[in-house]
């Protein structure tokens, strides 16, 4: 739940959600630093860093949901992302090890900032859900597969496979956030009307 008063203005809140998803779909915030830290920044390895189909809801799936269903799915998916991020963070090298390997501390900081960034977005999603619940016309909730458990780590044979799994997951996350941004951009001017 959000702390502090949520904005009561639909257009303001929608604008805030669009700004946040716009910033978060960007691979420089998560995927690229992860690739550099894990030593996967090689063209041949990057080819293997492609999302597993079905790991995240597709844009088509997201577009097919009602607004409430979309927010529920988004919230649940981001919940799973937070769990997986915690798992990835535990496996990252420590700051002093990075320095010794001549890698950029800033990459580690970017990865650490991902969690609060997602928490912030989720709080605004909560605010928008509240606002829609209080708006005049109810719309049937058509929830998606929800979390679809995006990232259950496959039993990896070794550390390298785990790194690739993390890479694929983050690739999928950014693609998902891009889709989320596109869906938000199609939302109408008022909470009572959809332009879908």
């Amino acid at each position: 739940a959000a702390i502090g008063s949520c904005s009561k203005e639909y257009r303001v809140l929608l604008g805030q959600l669009q700004k946040q998803t716009d910033l978060m779909q960007d691979t420089s915030r998560l995927l690229d630093p992860y690739i550099r830290i894990q030593g996967l920044d090689v063209p041949k390895l990057r080819e293997h860093c492609r999302e597993r189909p079905g790991a995240f809801p597709s844009e088509e799936t997201l577009r097919g949901l009602g607004r409430r269903g979309f927010l529920q799915t988004l919230n649940a998916t981001l919940g799973c992302v937070l769990h997986r991020l915690a798992d990835l963070e535990q496996r990252l090298p420590k700051a002093q090890d990075l320095e010794r390997s001549g890698l950029n501390i800033e990459d580690l900081e970017k990865l650490q900032m991902a969690r609060p960034n997602i928490l912030g977005l989720r709080n605004n999603i909560y605010c928008m859900a509240q606002l829609l619940d209080n708006s005049d016309t109810a719309e049937p909730t058509k929830a998606g597969r929800g979390a679809s458990q995006p990232p259950t780590p496959t039993p990896a044979s070794d550390a390298f496979q785990r790194k690739l799994e993390g890479c694929r997951f983050l690739h999928g996350y950014h693609r998902f956030m891009h889709s989320v941004g596109r869906v938000f951009s199609k939302w109408g001017e008022s909470p009572n009307r959809s332009r879908r």
Epitope: A2, I3, G4, S5, C6, S7, Q16, K19, Q20, L23, M24, Q25, D26, T27, S28, R29, D32, E106, E109, Q112, M113, R115, P116, N117, L119, G120, L121, N123, N124, Y126, C127
Partner: antibody, heavy 119, light 113 residues
């Protein structure tokens, strides 16, 4: 309406401690980061650091690391900037500003708190 | 740290004329994977806090008059006020958010000639 309201001007002596505040309203305080920015008299803007009030995750500019402490109390939607021992060179206007995602642009600013340090 | 350098330090422009401010970054703030420039512009009027005008180098913040426009890519950026109004007298700052620490240009003071 989004607002960041900062505490009033302060006049302090060198060596004294100080904590200034920035209260957010009109939006969910834990949906954003808060940055602090210094503006010395007649000078430009300097980024000091940033905090996510949801879990108090904090990052400082290397220039300000160890010089100030940034904190937040999400229960009262307030962020803080504090000094344990002020210097005359800390005399400046201090702004808090809201940041949608870190790092990014600063989309709403507080009115500023003028801190004067003089013996 | 990325160093931001603005030019000129100040300029005087007649009402209704065009004002152009330049900003140069010490390294590119263009991210190739999404082709976006991590650059913002702010306006600070005397005795007031800064106000966000433009982000992503060219996207106007909600409520900002369309006489303000941003352009440029990589390391070279421009803020243009197409027809200067009396209320535009202010100091203008560019800021990069490509990496931390966030850094600002030194500011450009715009006055009326």
């Amino acid at each position: 309406e989004v607002q960041l309201v900062q505490s009033g001007a302060e006049v302090k002596k060198p060596g004294e401690s100080l904590k200034i505040s920035c209260k957010g309203s009109g939006y969910s305080f834990t949906s954003y980061w808060i940055s602090w920015v210094r503006q010395m008299p007649g000078k430009g803007l300097e980024w000091m650091g940033i905090i996510y009030p949801g879990d108090s995750y904090t990052r400082y500019s290397p220039s300000f690391q160890g010089q100030v402490t940034i904190s937040a109390d999400k229960s009262i939607s307030t962020a803080y900037l504090q000094w344990s021992s002020l210097k005359a060179s800390d005399t400046a206007m201090y702004y808090c500003a809201r940041v949608p995602v870190s790092p990014a642009y600063l989309d709403y600013w507080g009115q500023g708190t003028l801190v004067t340090v003089s013996s | 740290d990325i160093v931001m350098t603005q030019s000129p330090d100040s300029l005087a422009v007649s009402l209704g004329e065009r004002a152009t401010i330049n900003c140069k970054s010490s390294q590119s703030v263009l991210y190739s994977s999404n082709n976006k420039n991590y650059l913002a512009w702010y306006q600070q009027k005397p005795g007031q806090p800064p106000k966000l005008l433009i982000y992503w180098a060219s996207t106007r913040e909600s409520g900002v008059p369309d006489r303000f426009s941003g352009s440029g890519s990589g390391t070279d950026f421009t803020l243009t006020i197409s027809s200067l109004q009396a209320e535009d007298v202010a100091v203008y700052y560019c800021q990069q958010y490509y990496s931390t620490p966030l850094t600002f240009g030194q500011g450009t003071k715009v006055e009326i000639k």
